[in-house]
């Protein structure tokens, strides 16, 4: 308990053999000789009290009764610490000129306290003297009297028997253990402009510090230093900056040292690297300095925008690392000579030149327009003019072709593409006009006749294993019967396709070759003729003229032209009444036969039941004599659409009686209108 009583709770720990050695406790009692009795005359007693380092002594009186005399000249108790007299005490209570301790507590200045008691040769009455108690206690070095310098620069930490200092982030404790020196070396500035200042600016800068700041810019830049706001660095009236100073060093020269209160002038270093050194000593209270630095470089020639272009950003001048871009007006494009640029940005180099030459903003040129198959192009704006906003007009070869997709007017747009009024960049399409014929029908039914040029310009002669026919659709498809080309479905190139001729054996014809054969998936060879329809894709488009013209496909409304007794025309080089293939293209006008009547005609042997299906139509005379025959297979049974005045294919020559033109039997044709979706799908997909 003694330890705790005298030294307080020492951080709650007790000395251990391995732990720190606590100082021996210092405490006790002092009293005048003979206390509590009266003290004798001519007494002199001296006590020297000593506490461990870092501790002080506290003393207070529990009893004090001494003779009172002027300035305590007779009897007194004197308290001293080192050379300093803390108090001279006498009497019982303090007066104007004498002091008695009362309830005061006295503290040594250091770790020692001297107490002297003296009585003179006489006392007028008896005095009982004094009783005092003392103890050692920790000094709180961190507490300082007002006006005194603080113990530590930044943070002070008291502990039993001593104290220590610590520093804020960015500082380090000096060797003197009290001063905080700034950690201010090795700061590097690489931006083209910035600010730097003494530590803590505009508050006083730290003591005992050595700061270095480096400005390091790319070669070609020159640093400019401007001192701003205020400048206050400790100075001396006679010696140049002996205490604190600022120096500026470049690869060319040294500026400074600077100190005092006057802002130094601007420094144009003509260097891309600058080192600023700031050194402070252990004393002083000055606010320091602030520098705003900028940089410059050899400017590049001012960029003049090319015609029809503009520069961005616009600056008063362009120096090293500055850049500009060129943007062209709508309808103009960036060109470096002949080379188109997606974008253009030039950067100013250290020698004062741009890293690339100025491009041109040249008017967009869409170039010569593509040729239009079966059409032509006309320059509207001017002969051969193909630049921005130029207009061209496509047209199709008259009579035999008509334009699809758009009106054929195209404008050269800013993206460099010829563009239609609908925004299409692809060419229009010259689609062959279908269903044109030189023939006029009187409507009477009469015997097979020779066709004249231009009567059946859609007529196609197909030579493969046998002779067959077909009808031209568009300019690269042939519609025919599945049974006519079934054997060649896997060898399309074996088909010899001829058109534009009337004479079967004539050497004067337009040759076409097959690229692919598409047989209806519902057709079964040698098992009836349902879905007897096929398409042949030609490997090249044929040129349309008066002798080669496609047949039209039936419109939705076409049924109204194919009712019972309506006249259709079949044509071909098939067998004639004489039993031979026709040399000249023949045709016959025949009426459509009632479907039930036709079905019934083919229900008796040798025809299997259900031979005539809803995908077929029949035509011919009940009396016979007018019919299509072998060799005509695949040819078109055509009808005139009186609204459009165009011929369309209503049927495909498919099958009939064993003897062509037999009375009571009819020619059976594939009903094309049932296959429009199939035809359109094949053609659009392939």
């Amino acid at each position: 308990m003694r330890l705790l009583t005298l030294l307080g709770l020492l951080c709650g720990s007790v000395a251990t053999p391995l732990g720190p050695k606590w100082p021996e406790p210092v405490f006790g009692r002092l009293a005048s000789p003979g206390f509590p009795g009266e003290y004798a005359n001519d007494q002199e007693r001296r006590w020297t009290l000593t506490a461990p380092p870092g501790y002080r002594l506290r003393l207070y009186f529990t009893h004090f009764d001494l003779e009172l005399s002027h300035l305590c000249e007779y009897d007194f108790v004197k308290l001293s610490s080192g050379a300093k007299v803390l108090a001279t005490l006498c009497g019982q209570e303090s007066t104007d000129t004498e002091r008695a301790p009362g309830k005061d507590t006295f503290y040594s200045l250091g770790s020692s306290l001297d107490i002297t008691f003296r009585s003179d040769y006489s006392n007028e009455k008896p005095f009982t003297g004094f009783e005092a108690f003392y103890a050692a206690e920790d000094i709180d070095e961190c507490q300082v009297a007002p006006g005194e310098a603080p113990t530590c620069d930044h943070h002070c930490h008291n502990h039993l028997g001593g104290f220590y200092c610590s520093c804020r982030a960015g500082y380090v404790l000096h060797r003197n253990k009290r001063t905080c020196s700034a950690l201010c070396s090795g700061q590097v500035f690489t931006q083209r402009s910035g600010e730097l200042s003494s530590p803590e600016y505009p508050r006083p800068y730290p003591k005992l510090s050595s700061c270095t700041y480096s400005i390091s810019l790319e070669e070609g830049f020159s640093v400019i230093l401007d001192f701003v706001e205020s400048f206050d660095v400790e100075t001396h009236p006679e010696t140049l900056c002996p205490y604190d100073f600022l120096k500026i060093q470049t690869d060319r020269e040294e500026h400074g040292p600077f100190c005092g209160k006057t802002l130094p002038h601007r420094i144009e270093t003509k260097s891309n690297t600058v080192t600023i050194t700031f050194v402070t000593d252990e004393s002083g209270d000055h606010t320091g300095w602030k520098i705003h630095y900028t940089s410059t470089a050899q400017p590049c020639p001012y960029p003049m925008a090319p015609p029809n272009g503009h520069v961005s950003p616009v600056q008063a001048k362009y120096i090293l690392k500055d850049s500009f871009s060129i943007f062209c007006e709508t309808g103009y494009e960036l060109l470096q000579g002949h080379l188109p640029l997606k974008s253009f940005t030039a950067v100013c180099q250290k020698d004062g030149s741009w890293d690339r030459p100025m491009p041109a903003c040249s008017i967009v040129d869409c170039g010569p327009p593509d040729d239009l198959p079966s059409g032509r192009v006309e320059y509207i704006t001017g002969p051969g003019v193909t630049t921005y906003k130029a207009v061209i007009q496509y047209s199709c070869e008259e009579t035999f072709y008509t334009m699809k997709v758009n009106d054929g007017k195209y404008v050269c747009e800013a993206d460099g593409f010829w563009t239609s009024s609908k925004g299409e960049k692809s060419l229009p399409v010259c689609e062959p006009v279908c269903g044109l014929s030189a023939r006029t029908t009187g409507g009477r039914i009469y015997g097979g006749q020779k066709a004249k040029p231009g009567d059946f310009p859609w007529q196609v002669l197909i030579l493969g294993g046998t002779t067959a026919a077909g009808a031209l659709l568009y300019d690269n498809w042939v519609l025919t019967a599945a049974h006519a080309v079934y054997e060649q479905k896997h060898d399309a190139s074996a088909l010899d396709i001829r058109m534009g001729t009337l004479k079967r054996l004539s050497p004067h014809y337009t040759q076409a070759w097959s690229e692919a054969v598409f047989i209806h998936e519902g057709y079964t060879h040698d098992a009836g003729f349902d879905n007897d329809i096929a398409l042949i894709k030609l490997n090249n488009k044929v040129v349309i003229n008066s002798n080669i013209t496609p047949i039209c496909l039936p419109r939705k409304e076409a049924e109204s032209f194919m009712r019972t007794d309506d006249i259709g025309t079949a044509s071909g080089w098939g067998l004639t009444q004489r039993g031979f293939l026709a040399r000249n293209l023949m045709y016959v006008d025949i009426p459509i036969v009632d479907h039930q009547k036709c079905t019934a005609a083919y229900e008796k042997p040798p025809y299997p039941r259900g031979s005539v299906t809803a995908n077929m139509l029949c035509a011919g005379l009940e009396s016979g004599g007018k019919d299509s025959c072998r060799g005509d297979s695949g040819g078109a049974l055509v009808f005139l659409d009186s609204e459009t005045e165009r011929w369309f294919v209503g049927g495909i020559v498919s099958w009939g009686s064993m003897n062509c033109g037999e009375a009571g039997q009819y020619g059976v044709y594939t009903k094309v209108i049932n296959y429009i979706p199939w035809i359109e799908n094949i053609i659009s997909d392939f």
Epitope: P306, G337, H338, L339
Partner: antibody
Amino acid sequence: QVQLVQSGAEVKKPGASVKVSCKASGYTFTDYYINWVRQAPGQGLEWMGWIFPGSESAYHSEKFKARVTMTVDTSISTAYMELSRLRSDDTAVYYCTRGDRSGPFAYWGQGTLVTVSS
Amino acid sequence: DVVMTQSPLSLPVTLGQPASISCKSSQSLLYSNGKTYLNWLQQRPGQSPRRLIYLVSKLDSGVPDRFSGSGSGADFTLKISRVEAEDVGVYYCVQVTHFPFTFGQGTKLEIK
């Protein structure tokens, strides 16, 4: 039609400068780049650089950068190529050419022979 | 710089016979827009050069169709289907995709 007519032959001493002109006609001068190409006697062709008369912006091959200056006078549709600090190996025929969108060598001047001799 | 290498450097040909000149570049001449900027020039004796072919294979106006160009990337060929007397001269390939523009050494075509 497009024509490029160059100035006449020159004889120069080493260290001197020469300025060759190229007068353009038959098109809008400021719309097309002018290139300069040289051909030493019995040797191949060498591209020196170009200038765009519309902005007077020039670009030179690194080999000639320090010695060549290309300029234009748009008022008379003429391009100039000045070569300084002449050496004997600068003896060559100097051609101006006009480009189009397909390349810089669509049209050629007739050439100017520059002889450098002491 | 892009190096253009022509072969052969000398090409003796019989009149009416075909001729072929090869030109190889040290790097691809394909530009970012998908075009290849390679030209062929003809220089007849005592004359200025003239362009025969641009963009590898396109003939300049007035150039006979017996001349043709082909190739891609870094490998190109100029062909003359039937050499005529007026075809005598030096033929240069030149790349105009990369700066600086560079020429081949030239191929001298002469009649055997």
